[in-house]
């Protein structure tokens, strides 16, 4: 019995659902009563899911698997694995027995995008050309381990004094911290590029340093020029700093964070103590760093609704303020592709290809391309619907007349994360069925 599975690993984002495709060709008169279908982990032989004696025996794998029961009779033995975890990565074997027996193994490659790196500079005051500084680039909750590249403002690699560490958390996701020690020139941009090798997703952060003395007078409050990009569900640091004068004590400090537009209070430090969060109890200051001029705000479990501008007010004797923008983002899932009609296709047939990608933010850009990368702009309809958390589900439909053969690719781009998720359908010149059986 010939059992077909994809040659390439199935790539699934942590937290999304994955389909491990497996198919066989049922003979005429085949009934499900004849079928024994077993999915198991290839290495350990642990049972994952089974269908025997004419019925679904259910999931033996943390109750997170399901078969496509309505498609089983047509030879679709695929397995749906829900809420993918890092620990799921590996090889799954699909055993099919009717009268004959066949099996094949499919690999699951788990991935998670890295957050936009946050950049910190030490020391960060009174910098002069010739000073040695430490620039730290931190990017969170990605998988698998990242590749980290440092570049100057012209793109030249900075390979000198770089130390990169990657630590896995309890879910197996990696936090990356890369430290560059560099001697300052007259001015310079230092960029850190964190690459997810599986998703081919690059997240980058930059810091531009113009060494000079700060002007005296009003309190100079520094915030990042670029928006702080935070993934939904992660924590974000809204950086804000000031330069305390000699003899400064926290008793002199009034620090207020508020929403720029509505002036809603977010967090405050006055009268020498932390007055706490006024923003759903999800904010915190870095109290141990406040005396050194670090007025940054930590915003926990970021939501879409948090997007916008936050103002950092600092008053000692003088007064200063600056606003920092928070840009919320969520990666789109790998698109699922459906084809209608999906049987006995011939050149000249008109088909509808649907590309669906879920739970991203902000709204996606959708591109359709043929196998050579040429855009397919003809008959395309794209809709994007926000769920109750404000995350978008994208559905894009392409109507196309089949040629002798062709690949139709849908690319769903997150414009903020610069993350592309794509799915493809390849249709050959022979009469065929989708998903392909070979």
């Amino acid at each position: 019995l010939e059992v077909q599975v994809p040659e390439d690993p199935v790539v699934a984002l942590v937290g999304t659902d994955a389909t491990l495709r497996c198919s066989f060709s049922p003979e005429p008169g085949f009934s499900l009563a004849q079928l024994n279908l077993i999915w198991q982990l290839t290495d350990t032989k642990q049972l994952v899911h089974s269908f025997t004696e004419g019925r679904d025996q259910g999931s033996a794998y943390a109750n997170r698997t399901a078969l496509f029961l309505d498609l089983l009779a047509q030879g679709n033995a695929s397995l749906r694995l829900q809420r993918v975890r890092v620990a799921d990565e590996g090889s799954f074997t699909c055993f099919v027995s009717i009268r004959d027996f066949g099996s094949a193994a499919v690999s699951l490659q788990v991935a998670a995008p890295y957050s936009k790196p946050s950049m910190t500079l030490e020391p960060n005051k009174d910098l002069r050309p010739g000073d040695t500084v430490t620039i730290t680039c931190s990017s969170y909750r990605g998988y698998p381990e990242a590749e980290v590249f440092w570049q100057d403002g012209q793109g030249a690699p900075l390979t000198g004094n770089v130390t990169t560490s990657q630590m896995a958390n309890e879910q197996g996701l990696f936090d990356v911290h890369s430290v560059l020690r560099v001697v300052l020139g007259a001015n310079g941009t230092y960029s850190c590029l964190v690459r997810n090798p599986v998703l081919q997703q690059d997240a980058h952060g930059s810091i531009t340093i113009t060494p000079q003395r700060s002007p005296t007078g009003a309190v100079e409050v520094q915030v990042p020029e670029d928006p702080v990009v935070a993934l939904v569900g992660t924590d974000a640091t809204l950086r804000c700093s000031f330069s305390p004068e000699p003899g400064f004590s926290l008793a002199q400090l009034n620090l207020i964070w508020q929403l720029t537009d509505t002036k809603q209070l977010v967090h405050s430090f006055t009268e020498g103590r932390d007055q706490g969060s006024a923003y759903a109890n999800r904010t915190a200051l870095f109290l141990d760093l406040l005396a050194q001029g670090n007025a940054s705000l930590r915003l926990q479990r970021v939501r879409v609704a948090d997007e916008g501008s936050f103002t950092c007010f600092v008053s000692i004797r003088d007064f200063g303020s600056a606003a920092v923008s928070l840009q919320v983002a969520a990666p789109y899932s790998k698109p699922s592709m459906t084809l209608e009609p999906n049987k006995d296709l011939r050149p000249g047939d008109t088909v509808t290809i649907t590309c669906s990608s879920y739970r991203g933010y902000p709204e996606a850009e959708v591109f359709w391309q043929d196998g050579q990368g040429a855009p397919l702009t003809g008959n395309v309809t794209t809709s994007q619907m926000a769920n109750e958390q404000g995350l978008f589900d994208v559905h894009s439909v392409l109507r196309v007349v089949l040629g002798a053969n062709g690949t139709y690719s849908c690319l769903v781009r997150n414009p903020v994360l610069q993350q592309d998720a794509h799915g493809s359908v390849t249709i050959t010149g022979q009469p065929m069925t989708f998903p392909p059986e070979a």
């Epitope: 570049q151 403002g153 793109g155 030249a156 690699p157 941009t189």
Partner: antibody
Framework: EVQLQQSGPELVKPGASVKISCKTS????????MHWVKQSHGKILEWIGG????????TYNQKFKDKATLTVDKSSSTASMELRSLTSEDSAVYYC?????????????WGQGTLVTVSA | QIVLTQSPAIMSASPGEKVTMTCSAS?????MHWYQQKSGTSPKRWIY???RVASGVPARFSGSGSGTSYSLTISSMEAEDAATYYC?????????FGAGTKLELK
Amino acid sequence: EVQLQQSGPELVKPGASVKISCKTSGYTFTEYAMHWVKQSHGKILEWIGGINPNIGGTTYNQKFKDKATLTVDKSSSTASMELRSLTSEDSAVYYCARFLVPSTEGFTYWGQGTLVTVSA
Amino acid sequence: QIVLTQSPAIMSASPGEKVTMTCSASSSVSYMHWYQQKSGTSPKRWIYDTSRVASGVPARFSGSGSGTSYSLTISSMEAEDAATYYCQQWSSNPLTFGAGTKLELK
């Protein structure tokens, strides 16, 4: 449409200097570094250096450090390269090429090239 | 500096033939780019980040490799593929190119 339009061919005498330009359009000039590449008659490509129009930072191939000076004019979205103390070895086609920073995407767009001929 | 050695220097292929050219680095590099140049025109980015095919490049082109050994492959040669192909690295300074592989139509 992204375009990198280079200045015309130059015939210069040995020992002289020449300044060639690369006028850009179709994108935000300050968001990309501009690099320069030499292609001599043997078809060998050599990287000269690059400049970040945003802050004016430059990175040079040490081989060309005393030969080339890179500048930008943000107001006209134009990058320029001056070559000095020219010899016959400097006769070549010089290309400007756009580079997204930071990235590992290589030179995504190239100018059409400027032929510099050094001859007495 | 990292020296990139391309081989062969010149090769020819018939239409439909599979073509592979290589680029060997004197030290390990993180990624490789490939450019196509036809006579009298500027180089064009063809493959970047080792294996990513640039926009508009036919799907018959692919790139692979790691460390010191990289290659560009054409699954089925076509007349329009006749050109010179250059590899390029910038994992360490200075940025360097290979001397090129000239691909001719047989």
